[in-house]
């Protein structure tokens, strides 16, 4: 066909304009073009022909009939994207084509999951707090926005700005905590991230914090300690930074820390530490023990010839250190350690506190008073000073090794050591039965060193044989069992005195009160057998012309002999035990005097003893019979006072003739002590036992009663 | 009409390569990924990989990477799968799939079988 | 990889009844789950995407729901012509469930 007049080529009237779509939405593509005839349009994505509804009814892209291209759905997956690309319309008619401009179709995009999650955030108020979010991938880029607690916050508020993904509180207040949520939005949509949440915790802070204190040792001490924090903080405490040594403390429910009886270790700083999850804070307070002063050694009594020299100890402890000064009774002249010596005088003080009189003259003798003396209080202790021309009370002859008991053979040979010494020298004679012996006998000889000799043994010799060394000054005895049988040793074994142990070094008295004295020692030298035991002997010209073992069995070193008499001076000596028998005796112990009954002992108060012994709780346990004549007493003490001298064990009969008879009594009279043996009780009798503990005329509470049977014969093993 | 048509069965020796061809029709061959998915006797269906007809991408699981190869022409819109060092277990049926853009395998191929035995 | 797990293996039904199949991915796949339906002989076919969308020309006894880690098909009146073997496919990874074939009781 020809060309006609009035016929152009086609020219684009309406270029399509690039769009940004959501997957799933239609959209158009727009294109007019003009031209006659009227021009035939084709659209061509990415140079492809694009495929429409005229190619295939079932195509989700129409072309209408102005020419637009319409997308019923946007069609776009993860990896197939077949709408998405650059668009153009060609129009065409014989006349020629005429092709538009490119137009970009892209597909808006909001994927569901968030590059970064916000994550839940701790922090102390008034700390800044930082949410950080990354939103989904998404075209065109999503912006976000925050909610807290599904309201959307406002970014206006001078603490709060929204920078890049971050939500930022600069000051953080407890009412910011919450859960939030970031929001990532674009054309496609919204997407809301995991919730993160913001907890704003508050730092420990004291609402009351422990103070200094200054205490008297005994009391009891509390230091306050209270926090508040969210969380609630945690309460420790500490003693100069270290953790507290158990037992000691108790630690209140409201962190309280309590000390029932201070003592001078529980001086220092204690340190609360209130921690929780945001910070940590510490407050400190000293506690100062204050110790009333005590004495750590007394004064004694002394008796001390004219000319020698006499010290008299005093050592006190306390907190603060006391201050010792001495006086003797009736004279103004105080006496201070340190103190640079006045020219004729013979009394110094040393820096332990100890009095030190030189060249002693009658004139010195009296009552010496030593004071010690703190802000937290004043004792004081009385010693007498005796001067004499010499020591006139000379003590009895000294046993240094007796006879042993000893199992001897018919036709035997026995011999009986007795060696003695003393100021005269003493004589040694020896008692069989009480009666002298060896008489007329010619198989018995004492020999030049005292020893018993019998020869050529009988049975009859069977007996108790006792040596007596008497003097002047006295006279001291010393008895043994032999026995003769016919299965024996035929001689007595010679014990060596290497097989023994060495004697004991002087008692020393460290303690004296109207009944006791308490006395320490040494053993043996190194080298000499170790002791077992150790027996104690006592000597009293105004008790009896002989030394008297006052204490058996004796397992320490330290002990008090009890049972003395007041206002008495007495020797001691110690002997050392071992399976082989009796050390020589110790060097005698200096003279000393028991304390006068009549005033009051000092530096007591009567009402603390009173106080003390009624808090004392004995436990009474169940008692043994040990032989139908003898039954076991064992107790135990709650708390064991200052003020306790011994213990009273009180009996009576409750069945038989004499029951309800009344108390009868026996004294443990140390401290210490905690059982005692009743003896000479009748068989098959019940009896009523309680214990009483007691400090001089002072007596605590009564145990409980226990009842106890002996038996008709002695218990079966 | 939208359809993918696949190239006849086959018959190899193990050790021997095989090249499975897939045309397109009816649809813009370059707006949508290729998938190779194959079944052995008897068994499911497993995931071979795919293909960007675009630009010519592919992306293969670990156990058939190194052994698998795909390429397309868009001149005459097909698609290729190459499978090298045939064994007997390769044994199987292979289809060639469409990913709509639904994320979905909406076109198959008739499928074409693969029999490796000496 | 993300693991597909389909249960049951096999299952015997009769004509109008109900039918449900599951399928268990071993971690969250949001909505990215599609179903197939393949008979002996043939290609699969793809009955629902996106989890719960139905594909085109695709009955509407066929119905899928389902979000994270597990997901259903339902057929909520089988029909002869519905006894074959159903596949779960995630369009993460790709990767199929191990099928449940349906047969006659």
């Known amino acids: 066909s020809r060309l006609r007049q009035e016929d152009f080529p086609p020219r684009i009237v309406e270029h399509p304009s690039d769009v940004i779509v959501s997957k799933g939405e239609p959209t158009t593509l727009n294109c007019k073009a003009e031209g006659r005839p009227t021009p035939t349009i084709e659209w061509y994505k990415d140079g492809e022909r694009v495929e429409t509804d005229k190619d295939d009814p079932r195509s989700h892209r129409m072309l209408l009939p102005s020419g637009s291209l319409f997308f019923l759905r946007i069609v776009h997956g993860r990896r197939s994207k077949p709408d998405e690309g650059s668009y153009v319309c060609v129009a065409r008619n014989y006349l020629g084509e005429a092709v538009s401009r490119n137009a970009s179709l892209e597909v808006a995009l909001l994927r569901d999951d968030f590059r970064q999650n916000p994550t839940d955030v701790v922090v102390a108020a008034g700390e800044p707090a930082i949410l950080e979010c990354q939103p989904p991938r998404g075209h065109p880029e999503p912006t976000i926005y925050w909610k807290k607690d599904k309201v959307r916050i406002d970014d206006k508020e001078e603490r709060i700005s929204i920078r890049g993904g971050k939500l930022m509180i600069s000051n953080t207040r407890k009412s910011d905590a919450g859960m939030y949520t970031c929001v990532g939005t674009n054309m496609v949509g919204e997407r809301d991230s995991d919730p993160a949440e913001l907890t704003v915790f508050e730092r420990p802070t004291f609402l009351r914090r422990p103070i200094n204190q200054v205490v008297l040792e005994e009391e009891a001490v509390e230091f306050r300690c209270q926090v508040q924090g969210d969380p609630q903080p945690t309460v420790r405490w500490k003693k100069d930074d270290a953790d507290l040594p158990r037992g000691r403390y108790d630690i209140k429910d409201d962190y309280t820390l309590r000390i029932k009886k201070t003592m001078s270790t529980d001086e220092g700083t204690y340190m609360c530490i209130a921690e929780n999850r945001v910070g940590k804070m510490e407050a400190s307070a000293t506690l100062t023990v204050r110790a009333p002063p005590q004495f750590v050694v007394r004064p004694r009594d002394q008796i001390v010839a004219q000319g020698r020299t006499v010290t008299f100890p005093c050592e006190t402890k306390g907190n603060p250190q006391p201050a010792v000064f001495w006086q003797k009774e009736g004279s103004q002249n105080l006496l201070f350690p340190n103190q640079p010596q006045q020219p004729n005088s013979r009394c110094s003080v040393s820096p332990t506190g100890d009095l030190t009189i030189t060249n002693i003259q009658r004139s010195d003798a009296g009552y010496y008073i030593c004071q010690a003396l703190t802000v937290a209080g004043s004792i004081l202790a009385k010693a007498q000073l005796e001067v004499t021309d010499v020591l006139t009370d000379r003590p009895p002859p000294i046993i240094l090794q007796g006879p042993a008991n000893q199992t001897l053979a018919v036709d035997g040979t026995a011999l009986l050591k007795c060696k003695a010494t003393g100021d005269p020298l003493p004589v040694i004679s020896w008692l069989k039965e009480g009666f002298t012996f060896p008489g007329r006998d010619p198989r018995a000889t004492i020999q030049e060193q005292g020893t018993l000799q019998i020869k050529n043994l009988r049975i009859s010799d069977t007996g108790t044989y006792t040596c007596v060394a008497t003097s002047s000054s006295g006279e001291t005895s010393w008895s043994a069992v032999l026995d003769v049988t016919e299965s024996g040793a035929t001689i007595s074994k010679n014990y060596d005195l290497s097989d023994l142990p060495g004697p004991p070094s002087k008692p020393q008295v460290t303690d004296v009160t109207k009944n006791s004295v308490t006395l320490s020692w040494q053993p043996g030298t190194p080298g000499t057998l170790p002791a077992s035991a150790y027996i104690i002997e006592a000597f009293s010209q105004s008790v009896s012309n002989s030394w008297q073992t006052v204490a058996n069995h004796v397992k320490t070193t330290l002990y008090t002999v009890r049972g003395l008499r007041p206002n008495t001076i007495y020797l001691f000596m110690v002997r050392a035990i071992n399976p082989q028998g009796l050390s020589d005796p110790s060097p005698m112990s200096d003279p000393v005097r028991t304390q006068d009954i009549s005033p009051p002992a000092q530096g007591v108060d009567h009402r603390q003893v009173q106080k003390e012994l009624g808090d004392v709780l004995v436990r009474l346990h169940n008692p043994v019979v040990l032989t139908p004549t003898t039954v076991q007493v064992t107790w135990t003490v709650d708390r064991q006072p200052q003020f306790i001298q011994g213990y009273r064990v009180m009996y009576r009969q409750t069945s038989g003739l004499q029951a309800t008879s009344s108390w009868q009594n026996l004294d443990a009279k140390v401290p210490t002590e905690r059982s005692a043996v009743l003896v000479n009780l009748k068989k098959g009798v019940t009896y009523e036992i309680k214990v009483r503990p007691y400090f001089n005329e002072f007596q605590g509470m009564d145990s409980e009663s226990k009842t106890v049977r002996t038996t008709e014969e002695a218990p079966s093993a | 009409e939208v359809q993918l048509v696949q190239s006849g069965a086959e018959v190899k020796k193990p050790g021997a390569s095989v090249k499975v061809s897939c045309k397109a029709s009816g649809y813009t061959f370059t707006g949508y990924y290729m998938h190779w998915v194959r079944q052995a006797p008897g068994q499911g269906l497993e995931w071979m990989g795919w293909i960007n007809p675009k630009n010519g991408d592919t992306e293969f699981p670990q156990k058939f990477q190194g052994r698998v190869t795909m390429t397309r022409d868009t001149s005459i819109t097909t698609a290729y799968m190459d499978l090298s060092r045939l064994r007997s277990d390769d044994t199987a049926v292979y289809y060639c799939?469409?990913?709509?853009?639904?994320?979905?395998?909406?076109?198959w191929g008739q499928g074409t079988m693969v029999t490796v035995s000496s | 990889d993300i693991q597909m797990t389909q249960s049951p293996s096999s299952l015997s039904a009769s004509v109008g009844d109900r039918v449900t199949i599951t399928c268990r991915a071993s971690?969250?796949?949001?909505?990215?789950l599609n179903w197939y339906q393949q008979k002996p002989g043939k290609a699969p076919k793809l009955l629902i995407y996106a989890a719960s969308s139905l594909q085109s020309g695709v009955p509407s006894r066929f119905s899928g729901s389902g979000s994270g880690t597990d997901f259903t098909l339902t057929i909520s009146s089988l029909q002869p012509e519905d006894f074959a073997t159903y596949y779960c496919?995630?369009?993460?990874?790709?990767?199929f469930g191990g099928g449940t074939k349906v047969e006659i009781k």
């Open positions: 971690q969250s796949i949001s909505s990215y």
């Open positions: 799939a469409r990913e709509s853009g639904d994320d979905a395998f909406d076109i």
């Open positions: 496919q995630q369009s993460v990874g790709l990767f």
